[in-house]
């Protein structure tokens, strides 16, 4: 099975123990991972940040010692924005560029592949979305020939439905793509104004959504039926939780919220916080399990986090070999407790290893 | 074997203008951002400009900003630094480097402003 | 911007010494601290970046630490060849900025 771990370039600005450079990864742990994100400027890819190559140099000398890790890089994200995406896709001028500039610029700096993370392609971006792929792989092909390893080609795809059926071609781009990484999680948000789960396996009778699609077994049964192989499909499990602030005396799921949770002390985000801040959470809290959907939750005042913990990363492991996927994707490494001293276990990677451990088992 | 190989410099007038170059070798320039790092006689290092490897971004300086450009042509293997309404207090070898971390360093040239 | 403050800024000792120079920056910039040494007339060398890593090809007798705003560089055992000048540089942010040097001369 593959273990496909995202590591994010911006969790080297968090301050003390949060901030997590390459050199921190083990390089046993994942059979790929990630580097998030490159930039596309001048129809070039490019680096996000003015270190980006030092940590690249980081990242992939963890391939000395282990040379079956893969690692790839991913081009996009949030905050590269859909709208630049879609211009270069849309014109063939700019996305020949773009792919052209791709393979010397990942041969450069080590990297195995590219993982393309538009997020999301617009309804008129369908098509060109299904081009940039197709293209980018005959280019991958071409530029291989002189005897050289091909490089990989993935990409990470919305676990929702409504942008699923607007965004993607899976069965076309389903071809090109060496592996697929649905981003099973952020189902549910404060949008919502109640709590509930972002990654629940399994809807369950306590889901408070008004759809029947916001859980992981939806999103990856309609992939399915959709035309992407078994084989080429990586169920993404969160090491990070979302967070809500209740509105009541209310604690279970469906409560009132009257927003998003509050900042992690290291990754400072309302409404989101770290497997490590978690556990650090998790003192004086009440955990309370989810059991249709098989994910944990926690209160503590007028806090409410869901998550997930080694007993439901093992339930959506199972699951996946069940539907005989490809494998587990992490988000991310740095979420997870990467040194091992928040979650009381003298274990680092808690969560990313019990996934491991579980793709393993018999 | 990685070369950078800086020219360009010489003698010019308070006011006057410059164009450096450095040309490069034996790595995939294009897949990596570059700098101009400036030495004045007896000084230490002085950061001067840099430009990211498809250059949509550059830096600069606050004591050079609006005075110098630097750019570059990928096809050609080459980084620039047009340098004008030069100052006596630009004089300095300079030096062009590669990486954010300057891995490797040209040799230097030499700009003299002087009347 | 962010100050770079070197000391000390020149010292004496022998070969076989163990040397030691530090680096402090005005703010905190994590582990982006990159040490290089120059040679009179020549260009300066990349030694040691991101606080730590040891350059490919650079003697295992230098060596890189700390994070935040203090960092040190240490020379185990100085040779002939390390007489230098050696500046840090924080790559955290631009504008970038080199501290002021630290001559080492033979005692």
């Known amino acids: 099975y593959k273990l496909v771990c995202y590591y994010t370039s911006w969790s080297q600005y968090r301050e003390g123990d949060g901030s997590c450079f390459p050199d921190a990864l083990d390089r046993f742990l994942c059979t790929h991972i990630i580097y998030s994100f490159a930039n596309i400027s001048n129809d070039h890819i490019d680096t996000w940040e003015w270190n980006d190559v030092t940590l690249y140099g980081m990242l992939n000398t963890l391939k000395n010692r282990n040379p079956n890790l893969k690692t790839l890089l991913s081009v996009g994200g949030w905050n590269f924005g859909s709208q630049r995406f879609s211009k270069i896709a849309s014109n063939t001028q700019s996305r020949r560029t773009f792919i052209k500039s791709v393979p010397p610029f990942l041969r450069t700096h080590g990297f195995d592949g590219l993982d393309l993370a538009w997020l999301y392609p617009g309804r008129r971006d369908k098509q060109h979305f299904t081009t940039l792929i197709k293209e980018m792989k005959a280019e991958f092909i071409k530029e291989a020939q002189p005897g050289k390893k091909q490089l990989l080609l993935s990409a990470a795809l919305s676990a929702g439905k409504v942008t699923i059926d607007s965004s993607y071609d899976i069965a076309k781009i389903s071809q090109h793509l060496d592996f697929i990484s649905i981003m099973t999680y952020d189902f549910h948000g404060a949008w919502r104004g109640t709590t509930g789960h972002h990654s629940p396996l399994f809807r369950g009778q306590e889901d408070a959504s008004p759809d029947r699609f916001s859980n992981t077994d939806y999103a990856v049964g309609y992939m399915l039926r959709l035309g992407a192989p078994a084989s080429k499909l990586v169920m993404g499990i969160p090491t990070f939780g979302r967070s809500f602030t209740l509105a009541s005396s209310e604690t279970g799921v469906g409560a009132p919220i009257s927003g998003p949770g509050i900042p992690g002390r290291f990754t400072k985000e309302a409404g989101t916080l770290a497997y490590y801040e978690i556990c650090d959470f998790l003192r004086g809290a009440t955990v309370h399990r989810i059991l249709g959907q098989q994910v944990p939750y926690a209160t503590k005042g007028n806090q409410w986090v869901g998550y997930d913990d080694q007993e439901s990363v093992k339930s959506k492991v199972q699951y996946l070999k069940d539907r005989q996927l490809a494998g587990a994707m992490v988000w991310a490494l740095d979420l997870d407790d990467f040194q091992g001293s928040f979650c009381g276990q003298d274990l680092r990677f808690p969560l990313t290893n019990a996934i491991k451990d579980a793709l393993a088992a018999t | 074997e990685v070369q950078l190989v800086e020219s360009g410099g010489g003698l010019v007038q308070p006011g006057g203008s410059l164009r450096l170059s450095c040309a490069a070798s034996g790595f995939t320039f294009s897949s990596y951002a570059m700098s101009w790092v400036r030495q004045a006689p007896g000084k230490g290092l002085e950061w001067v400009s840099s430009?990211?490897?498809?250059?949509?971004?550059?830096h600069y300086a606050d004591s050079v900003k609006g005075r110098f450009t630097i750019s570059r042509d990928n096809s050609k293997n080459t980084l620039y630094l047009q340098m004008n309404s030069l100052r006596a207090e630009d004089t300095a070898v300079y030096y062009c480097a590669k990486g954010g971390a300057f891995d490797y360093w040209g040799q230097g040239t030499l700009v003299t402003v002087s009347s | 911007d962010i100050q770079m403050t070197q000391s000390p800024s020149s010292l004496s000792a022998s070969v076989g010494d163990r040397v030691t120079i530090t680096c402090r920056a005005s703010?905190?910039?994590?582990?982006?601290l990159n040490w290089y040494q120059q040679k009179p007339g020549k260009a300066p060398k990349l030694l040691i970046y991101a606080a730590s890593t040891l350059q490919s090809g650079v003697p295992s007798r230098f060596s890189g630490s700390g994070s935040g705003t203090d960092f040190t560089l240490t020379i185990s055992s100085l040779q002939p060849e390390d007489f230098a000048t050696y500046y840090c540089?924080?790559?955290?942010?631009?504008?970038?900025?080199f501290g002021q040097g630290t001559k080492v001369e033979i005692k």
């Open positions: 540089q924080q790559s955290y942010s631009f504008p970038l900025t």
């Open positions: 703010q905190d910039i994590s582990r982006w």
């Open positions: 430009i990211s490897s498809s250059s949509g971004t550059t």
